[in-house]
C-alpha cells in the first residue's frame, strides 16, 4: 500500500530515509533542458535492489559528434559513480532483505527527488545547520495504516535557532509545556481525522516553532 | 528592520509599582525570547530575567525574583515589565534586547524618589 | 552565579594602536549542545549596548572585521586591529550559558 501524501514538514528540518521498503517508487526526475527516457519513467525497490536506473537525455534534438561523445562520457560517469557508491555506504544502510539503499545519483537528476513510499516506512528528521533540535520523543515519522487510510505519525522534533536553544533548555516551564500526550493508536472515530493532511501539519508542530526571518 | 522600542522614563514614589513597555517589529515577535537587563547609574549590567512570548515560559535571575513580573501581549507585539515595592535600589536604566543581546531597545529610565 | 572578570578597567589607546581585552569566567562557558554563549558587546556613551561578537568568535553582522574574538573554556579575549575614534566606550563580555547570565564588570577604551 502506497503512502497517501508525503512526510510532514517540520520547520528547519530535513528528513531522509535511512533505507527505503520494498515497493518504493522514486520517479525518475530531470533537471531543466533534459528529459527522461520513455521505459525509464520510475525506479522501484525490488527486495534490496532498485529496477532499474534512471536516464536523462538532452531535449535537443541535434545528434552531433560532440553531443554524442557527451552521451558516452555521461555513461561512462555513470558507471564510475555507481561502483564509487558501493564501498562508502552509510554504516545505518544496512543491507536488509526488502530495504534498498539510497540510489546512487543519475546524470542531469533534478534537484529534488520524488519517492512514493509505502505502507511501515519510516523516515529520519534532523534540524539544518544554524538550528538545534528541542527533542520530546523520537525525531521520525512512520507511514502507517490506520482506519483504513495511510498516513504519516507526527515527528516529536521541534528545531530552533542555536542562538536561542539553551534558553529553552533553561526553562522549566517551556520543558513542562513540552509534555504532549502519545497519540492515541487505538480506536477509530467516527470522524476521522486520523493523520495530519498536508496543510494541517506545520500547524500542528505546537508552540515551539520557530521561523527567524530576520537574520 | 527589527526595532525595540521602548516606553517613557519613570518618576515613582518608593514603595509604589511601575510597568515599562517593549514594543517589538521587523521579526515574529512570538518566536524570540525577550530579554530584560538593568543598568544602575555608573555601573555594569545585570540580567533580570527573560519571556518566550510564544508559551510565557520565563528565565529568572533569583535576584529579581518578586521584584519584577515579565508578561507580553501577543496581539501587539508588546513585551512588558512590572517591578513593584520600589526603592531607591530600582533607580536605573532598563533594556528589553532580543536574539540573545542582538538587537537592544533604547532603555527606560525609572527614577525612584519622594 | 558564574562571575566574569575582565581585564583591564580601563584601556589607553592610540588611534591606530591594536589593543586586547579578557574576560575570564569563574566556570566553563561550554553548554552541554556544543555552543560557548560568550558574547562581547559595545556601549557608547548614551546608547544601548550594540553586540559585537557572539558565540566567542562569531562577527556580528555589519561590525567591522578589526573586532575579533577567541578562547574557550573560561579564557576569553576581544581583539581591536587598529582602533578608532568610534570605537571609543565601554565594553562588555556577556555569558549566556548559565542562569542567570552574567556581564563582566565592564573595560572603558579611551584615547590617550
Known amino acids: 500500500e502506497l503512502c497517501l501524501y508525503d512526510p510532514p514538514e517540520v520547520p528547519n528540518a530535513t528528513f531522509k530515509a535511512l533505507s527505503y521498503k520494498n515497493g518504493t517508487i522514486l520517479n525518475c526526475e530531470c533537471k531543466r533542458g533534459f528529459r527522461r527516457l520513455k521505459e525509464l519513467v520510475y525506479m522501484r525497490c525490488l527486495g534490496n535492489s532498485w529496477s532499474s536506473n534512471c536516464q536523462c537525455t538532452s531535449n535537443s534534438h541535434d545528434k552531433s559528434r560532440k553531443q554524442v561523445t557527451a552521451q558516452l562520457e555521461h555513461q561512462k560517469e555513470q558507471q564510475t559513480t555507481t561502483d564509487m557508491q558501493k564501498p562508502t555506504q552509510s554504516m545505518h544502510q544496512e543491507n536488509l532483505t526488502g530495504h534498498c539503499r539510497e540510489p546512487p545519483p543519475w546524470k542531469h537528476e533534478d534537484s529534488k527527488r520524488i519517492y512514493h513510499f509505502v505502507e511501515g516506512q519510516s523516515v529520519h528528521y534532523e534540524c539544518i545547520p544554524g538550528y538545534k533540535a528541542l527533542q520530546r520523543g523520537p525525531a521520525i515519522s512512520i507511514c502507517k495504516m490506520k482506519c483504513g487510510k495511510t498516513g504519516w505519525t507526527q515527528p516529536q522534533l521541534t528545531c530552533v535557532d542555536e542562538r536561542e536553544h539553551h534558553r529553552f533548555l533553561a526553562s522549566e516551564e517551556s520543558q513542562g509545556s513540552r509534555n504532549s500526550s502519545p497519540e492515541s493508536e487505538t480506536s477509530c472515530p467516527i470522524t476521522t481525522t486520523d493523520f495530519p493532511q498536508p496543510t494541517e501539519t506545520t500547524a500542528m508542530t505546537e508552540t515551539f516553532v520557530l521561523t527567524m526571518e530576520y537574520k | 528592520q527589527v526595532k525595540l522600542l521602548q516606553s517613557g522614563a519613570a518618576l515613582e514614589k518608593p514603595g509604589a509599582s511601575v510597568k515599562m513597555s517593549c514594543k517589538a517589529s521587523?521579526?515574529?515577535?512570538?518566536?524570540?525570547?525577550v530579554i530584560w537587563v538593568k543598568q544602575s547609574h555608573g555601573k555594569s549590567l545585570e540580567w533580570i530575567g527573560e519571556?518566550?512570548?510564544?508559551?510565557?515560559?520565563?528565565n529568572f535571575n533569583a535576584k529579581f525574583k518578586g521584584k519584577a513580573t515579565l508578561t507580553v501581549d501577543k496581539s501587539t507585539s508588546t513585551a512588558y515589565m512590572e517591578l513593584s515595592r520600589l526603592t531607591s535600589e530600582d533607580s536605573a536604566i532598563y533594556y528589553c534586547?532580543?536574539?540573545?543581546?542582538?538587537?537592544w531597545g533604547q532603555g527606560v529610565m525609572v527614577t525612584v524618589s519622594s | 552565579d558564574v562571575v566574569l572578570t575582565q581585564t583591564p578597567p580601563t584601556l589607553s589607546a592610540t588611534i591606530g594602536q591594536s589593543v586586547s581585552i579578557s574576560c575570564r569566567s569563574s566556570?566553563?562557558?561550554?553548554?552541554?549542545?556544543?555552543?560557548?554563549?560568550l558574547y562581547w558587546l559595545l556601549q557608547r556613551p548614551g546608547q544601548p549596548p550594540q553586540l559585537l561578537i557572539y558565540?566567542?568568535?562569531r562577527l556580528e553582522s555589519g561590525v567591522p572585521n578589526r573586532f575579533s574574538g577567541s578562547g574557550s573554556g573560561t579564557d576569553f579575549t576581544l581583539k581591536i586591529s587598529g582602533v578608532e575614534a568610534e570605537d571609543l566606550g565601554l565594553y562588555y563580555c556577556?555569558?549566556?550559558?548559565?542562569?542567570?547570565?552574567?556581564f563582566g564588570a565592564g573595560t572603558k577604551l579611551e584615547l590617550k
Open positions: 534586547t532580543t536574539y540573545d543581546f542582538d538587537y
Open positions: 556577556v555569558q549566556s550559558t548559565h542562569v542567570p547570565n552574567t
Open positions: 519571556i518566550y512570548p510564544n508559551s510565557g515560559a520565563t
Open positions: 558565540f566567542v568568535s
Open positions: 566556570q566553563s562557558l561550554s553548554h552541554t549542545n556544543g555552543n560557548t554563549y
Open positions: 521587523g521579526y515574529t515577535f512570538t518566536d524570540y525570547w
